[in-house]
Amino acid sequence: PLATIPVSTTSLTSSEGSTISTPSVDISTPVTTSIVGDQCSRCKNGGFWDGLKCQCLTPYYGESCEEVVNSIDIAPPETVSAQMELTVTVTSVKFTDELKNHSSQEFREFNKTFTEQMNIVYSGIPEYVGVNITNLRLGSVVVEHDVLLRTKYTPEYKTALDNATEVVKQKITKVTTEQIMTNDNCSALMCFNTTGTQVQNITVTQYDPVEECRQKAEEYEDYFLVEYRDQKPYCISPCESGFNASKNCNHGKCQMSQNGARCLCVTTETHWYSGEDCNQGTQKSHHHHHH
């Protein structure tokens, strides 16, 4: 991924009135062109010259791609899903060869009725999307199918989908136990063989914002972390303000280095600032400390 370097700057003003300007970073879609002339040495950390400016790789920015961004854009999917592979045995329909052909009228009718039946069974599950028949075989009709579940991405999406899969198991077990043939007849839309119900496999969407954050941070992976705001994950360094992990540099500017975040303290007309958090002020004229 590449980062474009914006022209705008943000001014940090110390309490004494001096300023430090830092670029506002926007990671967006880059323009990729070839390296021109001998400008390639100007762009550090894998960035390249596009004829006008350095195009930087994430997580770098700056005129020469020498600075590290405070936050990296990570985009979790809007929705996450689970797929359950199930097998049920329908006893109220006798298997015929036409059911093998997914484009036959018979298959289409079976698919419609089966879908209607499953929509009734799973009607109380908000994550339920639908069913997809993958195979029909003899016995009366053994139905291999997928139950599809979907939910909005939240940090707890796995729990939500795990709970939904449990409810699916309970509901399909219940219906295949209750809707059974009596005297070779079925009074329900479909009847089942209780012992023919099996959950073959469950696949849940895998999305880990922490992993994505670490990958994009590359050699700074140990210093970037994920924090949530309104259930949305943010990949930030301690230099990003407004988060629990934000580093307070007081009279200074936070800068990332390969050893982590550090504060670069300012010097004003009246004070020198020092200390790990730039909170120790020394007055130039009187040479005394105050905190």
Epitope: S92, V93, E98, L99, E109, T113, N185, S187, L189
Partner: nanobody
């Protein structure tokens, strides 16, 4: 397009007989399951009888021994012979079809329906 057309309904006295017919077209008649349903005024639709492609039949308890379902695959026709008719048999009778070999009289399992024919049993 599947089409089902019923005929043979009418007014009959208690104890009398009627024979309903259903002419089918638009599908391979010999392969599916055919059924008769009925709906009395103010009541739910109920299954009367069904017949599978191999001639297997099933009847509702209320009509067993009085009604006979049959099919003629050569004529693409379904029949319902109704004997010893009672006042409670008064209803609109519907012919229904499924392309599947069904063993159910649940109306929702049958996708194709005729318009119905009225049977009135009254003295």
């Amino acid at each position: 397009e599947v089409q089902l057309v019923e005929s043979g309904g009418g007014l009959v006295q208690p104890g009398g007989s009627l024979r309903l017919s259903c002419a089918a077209s638009g599908f391979t008649f010999s392969r599916g399951t055919m059924a008769w349903f009925r709906q009395a005024p103010g009541k739910e639709r109920e299954g009367v009888a069904f017949i599978n492609s191999d001639g297997r039949t099933s009847y509702a308890e209320s009509v067993k021994g009085r009604f006979t379902i049959s099919r003629d695959n050569a004529k693409n026709s379904l029949y319902l012979q109704m004997n010893s008719l009672r006042a409670e048999d008064t209803a609109v009778y519907y012919c229904a079809a499924s392309l599947l070999y069904l063993m159910t009289v649940n109306a929702a399992a049958y996708p194709y329906w005729g318009q119905g024919t009225m049977v009135t049993v009254s003295s």
